[in-house]
């Protein structure tokens, strides 16, 4: 799995982003782990990465993953100063020049290396569930999340806001 | 334009209820996270309550857990502070504020101007 | 519980000085901060967040830096109407305020 070392190779360069044409307005590392408190691991393997939902061993290094926060302008026809209707949209990278990418054809989440601009499949919504949990909507289909299935990362459909609070589309990020 | 306008302050004795309103126009009131926030005469800032946009998940200040309520009507465009068994250290002003973001709890893009609430015997 | 602690208390500078407030966490915060502004008598106003992004409207005189525990906000030119009582805020972990510093012309 990658440890940090992975990460400390991005230079103070921030990403574009193809939802606004601008820099990040945020980045910092974090590691991501299910509500339940399994890690999301990375790890190469046959020349792709893999990614894993994992309880880690006692002592065992978690994973860092690059968040980078966008500002998107909502598609709606509120007033305002351009302040009201925004959305956050998050980029997620575990090592340089790979990042988390939604693949909706498989529902699946796969680690793609690719060149910025990012592809939309790279963006997801950010929500906050709870004060310290997010879920990540896909950019590319609304209703759709990242969530926990199998001991691995897929994408889920959530039909109702009442299904939000699954516990299994809810993830905590922390920097240790 | 956003607005947020707060109502039901106002001077009520120790132990006893008080229920604050806050209507909002001008945004898409079910997209935000909305929130309670206090100030004491003279004093700072205080977090009270926190309401995610679809009204599930509810934050309080340790100090007020048990006694306050937070809710909302998202048809009605209204969030609700309900107090109960009231004390003199909830004397303040009451601020209603949105968040920055649909469905995230990041920042207070806008404020109310806030309603009085005096705790006295 | 997160913690804020700003400093100074009160700051008081001539018209046209460059101004630096502090805020310090007790943890770890991953620039998710905020710069309030409260003039008397008035509501507080979104000034700077995520740590150095300005709120649309707001002069640009205002700036915002800091990472991991500490954070600054700065006014590079201090004008009369900047009187008012600042507010760091932190929503990283909870949501937690600074005590607030308050900034009076000379």
């Known amino acids: 799995a990658f440890g940090i070392s992975g990460v400390q190779k991005y230079t103070r360069a921030l990403h574009d982003s193809s939802i606004t044409g601008i820099s990040p307005i945020t980045e910092y590392l974090a590691s991501l782990s299910t509500y339940n408190d399994q890690s999301i691991t990375f790890a190469l393997e046959d020349e792709s990465y893999e990614i894993y939902v994992e309880d880690l061993k006692k002592d065992e290094k978690k994973d860092k993953v690059l968040l980078s926060y966008y500002e998107s302008q909502h598609p709606s026809n509120e007033s305002g100063d351009g302040v009201d209707g925004k959305m956050l949209m998050v980029t997620l990278s575990p090592t340089k020049d790979f990042w988390l990418h939604a693949n909706n054809k498989e529902h699946s989440v796969e680690l793609h290396k690719c060149e910025k601009p990012l592809p939309d499949q790279a963006f997801f919504v950010l929500h906050n569930m709870h004060s310290n949990c997010v879920s990540f909507e896909c950019k590319t289909d609304p209703g759709v999340f990242i969530g926990v299935k199998d001991n691995h990362l897929a994408l889920i459909k959530v039909d109702s806001s009442e299904n939000l609070c699954t516990e299994n589309i809810l993830f905590k990020l922390s920097e240790t | 334009e956003v607005q947020l306008v707060e109502t039901g302050g106002g001077l009520v004795q120790p132990g006893r209820s008080l229920k604050l309103s806050c209507v909002a126009s001008?945004?898409?009131?079910?997209?935000?996270?909305m929130y309670w926030i206090r100030q004491a005469p003279g004093m700072g800032l205080e977090w009270v309550s926190s309401?995610?946009?679809?009204?599930?998940?509810?934050y309080y200040l340790d100090s007020v857990k048990g006694r306050f309520t937070i809710s909302r009507n998202n048809a009605e465009n209204t969030v609700y502070l309900q107090m109960n068994s009231l004390r003199s250290e909830d004397t303040a002003t009451y601020y209603c504020?949105?968040?920055?973001?649909?469905?995230?709890?990041?920042?207070?893009?806008?404020w109310g101007q806030g309603t009085l609430v005096t705790v006295s015997s | 519980d997160i913690q804020m602690t700003q400093s100074p208390s009160v700051l008081s500078a001539s018209v046209g000085d460059r101004v630096t407030l502090s805020c310090k966490a007790s943890?770890?915060?991953?620039?998710?901060l905020d710069w309030y502004q409260q003039k008397v008598g008035e509501a507080p106003k979104l000034l700077i967040y995520?740590?150095?992004n300005l709120q649309t409207g707001i002069p640009s005189r205002f700036s915002g830096s800091g990472s991991g525990t500490d954070y600054t906000l700065t006014i590079s030119s201090l004008q009369p109407e900047d009187v008012a009582t600042y507010f760091c805020?932190?929503?990283?972990?909870?949501?937690?305020f600074g005590q607030g510093t308050k900034v009076e012309i000379k």
């Open positions: 309401i995610n946009n679809d009204g599930g998940n509810t």
């Open positions: 504020a949105k968040g920055r973001y649909y469905y995230s709890s990041y920042s207070f893009a806008y």
């Open positions: 805020f932190q929503y990283n972990s909870g949501w937690t």
């Open positions: 001008g945004f898409t009131f079910s997209n935000y996270w």
């Open positions: 943890h770890n915060i991953n620039k998710h």
């Open positions: 995520f740590t150095n």
